[in-house]
């Protein structure tokens, strides 16, 4: 019996087409994904196999401003709109809390939405329970397929799911429901979650009775043969995964953004061990149309949001100085203002031992595009943040030893006076340089503002200390020169987008006045 | 081979209630969605109620709510229609036949032969 | 409710004729339209699913287009056994609807 899974992950908003790159869609000739695209595809696929489903592997919230405006009722919208069979939780579908889960998808997506390791308590508990199950058994043709879900159990610091969800160890968590499975004579299982790659690996290497793992959060791309694109390949798809119980088992991931559709066909004997596993994803791009009707759709949603792209945010009564006269050679106040949303966006009060599990900011000045004059009455729009940051990317949380952020700092003035975008904006830092040094010699004082405290202090980095930072997914990926970040870097989650973080924290403000106050010098 | 069997049509007064079965087999019954069409005399096709693979869900038209329940027995491989306070415009052959294997609203591939149903005092 | 509208409600043609039978929605429906034949004091049989798709078995002089509104279902060269009656179906949404139907009868 063979079973067609098309699968997605970390779609992150990316309704409409993009570029190349996942951001905005300029030249709609060279464009990809996008759901009407997306559509167009798997209806091609449904046409010509007969026992196809198709699965989210979480984290459709957060990225563009759709989800800005729509708060996830987009999400169900067009995920019911392409059939989808099941989702599994990722942990941006918590980034508006319990209730910006429960009400605009929960309660309205047609499909399940999974996760065995989320478990809910106190006054919650009741109001969510059968919202979101920790698995579904589907019926495909005349046969069925378990899926079992599973979520990061670090979501409590990468989102605000709140303190009435535990998130426990996936694997603990997923052994158990797949038993239940295989009591319920379900020999077919997949495993479908929001972990990352590593987990995902885990999983089909420690959970009996799992067949398949579909995964995300890592945005991992695997690829058998020649890349379509400029993805490069993390490994084979599928990747194998010898299991404890010497079962050959197949991990997928689809990169993210909607610009791939996994497609993975598998062949299951009659009692539902893999025989085989084979495929690939799909390139989404120009080439596959766009679907008329589900695009009208798009269209038709649309125009609320170029409404809200010029709604006062909030207001500033200071001049915002993005420019790169400042931003690459100084600390700008534009910079200041950007880092503080970035850890504002990023307050999580988990243990009473940490004010906050993170308190440090990174920001590349290049990325800094424009300034915003507080002449215009003081108004800030979405439109005028595009401006500032237009790259669409988002704002990271890495784990980075004292050695590597070093690094990075004497990397940020290596060649300083060349209006180069590598000259870093900060936030809980103080830095001091000395420009008179040799390149790689540079940084003289180095001080953090402590997170394990209950008055937060600067005090001097040290280099063996690991150390969470907030940071564009630009320099987290080794942009401008930061390789030592990339390649020393011992934890990466992708986090929200950097205009939703800095329009929210706006918003939250209602009055901005970010100075320069010598946190560069 | 796949079939489906409707049984249970007739003559009924108005007011009072019909129960129609359809047996299925030849298809893991209990993986599909079941739904029952009607045709009155001479007039098209009119959907009058589905079930969903598992029961959880059951959805029919304004014309019939309140007045009709489907159900199934998926050990029987078994569909029913329950139909009371019928009215002359019930009149019509009852079809049921087989839908997809999701929540999501599905064509019909696989029809049984029909069961007339006739309302008349 | 979705509204299904069929023109023409019937037809006369010749064996060997091209034959076409269109179908409007009252709103989108994407692709979830089906196609049925229905022969005299006989049950339907599926033609086409998802505007497009032929079921199995079905002979290729059957096609089916269409997405959104408006839906075509096309018989290449019409067979002494396709003439009876054509229905489209929507299943973009409970409450499912049939067209009125299309009577295609030997000119």
């Known amino acids: 019996w063979e079973l067609t899974i098309l699968h997605t992950n970390d779609v992150h908003s990316r309704l409409e087409q993009t570029s190349e790159d996942s951001s905005k869609c300029v030249n709609a000739s060279r464009c990809m994904g996008g759901v009407a695209r997306l559509f167009t595809k798997v209806q091609q696929i449904r046409r010509a196999e007969p026992n196809v489903l198709l699965l989210d592997a979480g984290d459709q919230y957060q990225g563009t401003i759709w989800f800005t405006v729509y708060k996830g009722a987009e999400v169900a919208h067009f995920m019911n709109a392409l059939r989808y069979d099941a989702m599994a939780l990722g942990n941006h579908e918590f980034d508006n809390g319990v209730e910006g889960l429960i009400e605009p998808l929960l309660k309205e997506a047609k499909f399940p939405i999974l996760s065995a390791n989320i478990k809910a308590k106190g006054p919650l508990a009741s109001q969510i329970s059968g919202l979101y199950l920790p698995y579904k058994v589907l019926p495909v043709g005349d046969e069925v397929v378990g899926i079992v879900g599973y979520t990061s159990k670090e979501t409590p610091f990468l989102s605000n799911p709140g303190t009435n969800l535990v998130f426990e160890d996936e694997i603990t968590a997923l052994q158990p429901e797949v038993d239940k499975l295989k009591t319920l004579n379900v020999n077919k299982i997949i495993a479908l979650g929001h972990s990352g790659f590593e987990m995902d690996k885990l999983i089909a290497q420690k959970v009996r009775g799992v067949d398949v793992v579909v995964g995300g959060h890592s945005n991992t791309f695997l690829y058998t043969g020649n890349p379509p694109s400029k993805e490069v390949p993390a490994g084979k798809y599928p990747f194998i995964v010898t299991s404890d119980d010497g079962r050959k088992v197949p991990v997928v991931q689809a990169y993210a953004f909607g610009k791939y559709l996994g497609y993975l066909k598998i062949e299951f004997d009659e009692r539902g061990n893999v025989i085989s596993s084979h495929g690939n994803p799909i390139l989404l791009n120009s080439s596959i149309p766009e679907d008329p009707s589900i695009k009208a759709d798009i269209n038709k949603w649309r125009i609320k949001l170029d409404n809200y792209s010029t709604q006062e945010l909030g207001k500033t009564i200071v001049y915002l100085d993005g420019s790169s006269q400042s931003c690459r050679f100084r600390e700008c106040n534009m910079g200041n203002l950007i880092c503080d949303a970035m850890i504002n966006n990023n307050l999580r009060h988990t243990d009473e031992m940490f004010w906050n599990h993170v308190s440090m900011c990174i920001l590349n000045g290049g990325g800094i595009r424009s300034p915003i004059d507080e002449r215009n009455n003081g108004t800030i729009t979405w439109e005028n943040l595009a401006a500032v940051l237009p790259f669409g990317g988002t704002f990271d949380l890495v784990q980075l030893k004292g050695s590597t952020l070093k690094k990075a700092f004497e990397h940020s003035v290596h060649r300083y006076g060349q209006s180069t975008g590598e000259f870093l904006q900060v936030g809980g830092i103080h830095v001091v340089y000395d420009l008179s040094r040799k390149p790689g010699d540079r940084v003289v004082k180095l001080d953090v503002l402590c997170t394990k405290c209950r008055v937060p202090s600067y005090d001097p980095l040290k280099m063996d200390e690991v150390y969470k930072v907030i940071l564009p997914n630009f320099l987290a990926n080794g942009g401008d020169g930061f390789q030592m970040i990339k390649d020393e870097l011992l934890r990466h989650d992708s986090g929200d987008q950097d205009i939703n973080v800095v329009s929210t924290y706006i918003s939250k403000m209602k009055v901005i006045y970010p100075a320069v106050e010598g946190r560069i010098k | 081979q796949v079939q489906l069997v409707e049984s249970g049509g007739g003559v009924v007064q108005p007011g009072r209630s019909l129960r129609l079965s359809c047996a299925s087999s030849?298809?893991?019954?209990?993986?599909?969605?079941m739904h029952w069409v009607r045709q009155a005399p001479g007039k098209g096709l009119e959907w009058v109620a589905v079930i969903l693979y598992d029961g959880s869900n059951k959805y029919y038209p304004d014309s019939v709510k309140g007045r009709f329940t489907i159900s199934r027995d998926n050990s029987k491989n078994t569909l029913y229609l329950q139909m009371n306070s019928l009215r002359a415009e019930d009149t019509a052959v009852y079809y049921c036949?087989?839908?997809?294997?999701?929540?999501?609203?599905?064509?019909?591939?696989?029809w049984g032969q029909g069961t007339m149903v006739t309302v008349s005092s | 409710d979705i509204q299904m509208t069929q023109s023409p409600s019937s037809l006369s043609a010749s064996v060997g004729d091209r034959v076409t039978i269109t179908c409007r929605a009252s709103?989108?429906?994407?692709?979830?339209l089906a196609w049925y034949q229905q022969k005299p004091e006989k049950a339907p049989k599926s033609l086409i699913y998802?505007?497009?798709s032929l079921q199995s078995g079905v002979p290729s002089r059957f096609s089916g287009s269409g997405s959104g509104t408006d839906f075509t279902l096309t018989i290449s060269s019409l067979q002494p056994e396709d003439f009876a009656t054509y229905y489209c179906?929507?299943?973009?949404?409970?409450?499912?609807?049939f067209g009125g139907g299309t009577k295609v009868e030997i000119k």
């Open positions: 179906q929507q299943y973009n949404s409970y409450p499912l609807t």
């Open positions: 036949a087989r839908g997809g294997s999701s929540w999501y609203p599905d064509s019909f591939d696989i």
């Open positions: 030849g298809f893991t019954f209990s993986n599909y969605g």
């Open positions: 998802a505007a497009s």
């Open positions: 709103q989108g429906i994407s692709s979830w």
